[in-house]
């Protein structure tokens, strides 16, 4: 008789999840000498331990602490790039400018990027059929709690000038409900961070508006200023040209606005 299984509203665990996490860990630790000491089997065991046999709507940051400890990594605190709703360009940027880091350039972010996972209460099974959706089911699900935990730690580690890439094509360029707006903004440490510098990425070819004057950017500025951190903003009108100028800063076309 097939056992009754909870149906959630979100997609199930990514297929071959354990193998994917383990393979990513091995690849990352091979590429990054400073993380060569990491035992990837222990990392997987800690990852699994955070959600297996637990109700997928009752996950806590505490559940992820063993994984956080194993994945502890020192990233230069003044080289942090946050992003919201524009992950691909942020990653393209750090692939060119190798000394800047998004969360997904760290071991823990790299392991989980684009993956979904959850278990079931009181069984050691991984649920490949469905997982809780943040809105429709519950916010304390394994994926959301993981990203909240690692994002908080990443923001807490930042110092000096912190950069954030924002999507100028969205109706809310700054969204208070995004991970950036709800977690990272509130966990920047004013005693360490002097300025948050926002790069607003334009989508349209002929879009010459100053999106740094957008009401949601003004809202971000207000939140940041109240936290005693300075705020600055730059329109990136041509993201393609921006990346080209990052690759080749001395190119003569890089004298004008990018």
């Amino acid at each position: 008789v097939p056992r009754w299984r909870q149906q959630w509203s979100g997609p199930g665990t990514t297929k071959r999840f354990p193998e994917t996490v383990l393979a990513r860990c091995v690849k990352y630790t091979e590429i990054h000498p400073e993380m060569r000491h990491v035992d990837c089997q222990s990392v997987w065991d800690a990852f699994k331990g955070a959600f297996i046999s637990k109700h997928p709507c009752n996950i806590t940051e505490e559940d992820y602490q063993p994984l956080m400890k194993l994945g502890t990594q020192t990233v230069p605190c003044n080289k942090i790039l946050l992003w919201s709703r524009i992950k691909d360009l942020a990653h393209q940027f750090t692939q060119v400018q190798r000394d800047m880091f998004t969360l997904e350039d760290t071991l823990l972010g790299y392991l989980a990027d684009d993956l979904t996972w959850c278990g079931e209460f009181n069984t050691s099974k991984i649920n490949y059929q469905s997982c809780p959706d943040w809105r429709k089911d519950c916010s304390n699900n394994p994926v959301s709690v993981f990203w909240k935990t690692v994002s908080r730690r990443f923001a807490e580690a930042a110092c000096d000038v912190v950069h954030v890439m924002l999507n100028g094509s969205r109706s809310k360029i700054f969204d208070k409900n995004s991970t950036f707006g709800s977690v990272e903004v509130h966990n920047l440490q004013p005693e360490k961070v002097q300025t948050l510098e926002a790069w607003v990425i334009h989508g349209g070819r002929e879009d010459s508006r100053d999106l740094c004057q957008d009401p949601t950017i003004k809202e971000l500025e207000s939140i940041i200023s109240k936290r005693n951190i300075q705020f600055s903003c730059k329109n990136i009108y041509r993201p393609d040209k921006f990346l080209q100028c990052v690759k080749n800063p001395e190119d003569s076309s890089c004298t004008s606005e990018i």
Epitope: M100, V161, W199, I236, C245, V246, P249, C254
Partner: nanobody, 125 residues
């Protein structure tokens, strides 16, 4: 190759002000993070202030906060350091530096690629 030339140094009494300038030869300079460092004989170059290329975000050493202001005029390819309420411990050779990486800004002197020759600032008590 970017050439940087500092000016504006001199002798000033404690409590006085100076404005240092750093002119860059390179037209793409506007996108580069720029920094000011100071050095006294027998010591390492010490970070004073820096400014990002894209949005002009400023970063200051604790000793410079509230007294010094870094700014830039990209049309003139120049970065400035306005120094107020100067003290004898501010004495040294002030160097301007450029980092050709777009984005990011650092206190680490080794990360700046281009350097000027320096301008002497002497603060007498």
């Amino acid at each position: 190759e970017v050439q940087l030339e500092e000016s504006g140094g001199g002798l000033v009494q404690a409590g006085g002000s100076l404005r240092l300038s750093c002119a860059a030869s390179e037209r793409t300079f506007g996108n580069y993070p720029m920094g000011w460092f100071r050095q006294v004989p027998g010591k390492e170059r010490e970070f004073v202030a820096a400014i990002t290329g894209l949005a002009g975000s400023r970063l200051y050493a604790d000793s410079a906060k509230g007294r010094f202001t870094i700014s830039r005029d990209n049309a003139k390819n120049t970065v400035y350091l306005q120094m107020n309420n100067l003290q004898p411990e501010d004495t040294g050779v002030y160097y301007c530096a450029a980092d050709r990486r777009i984005g990011g800004v650092t206190r680490e002197s080794r990360e700046y690629e281009y350097w000027g020759q320096g301008t002497q600032v002497t603060v007498s008590s």
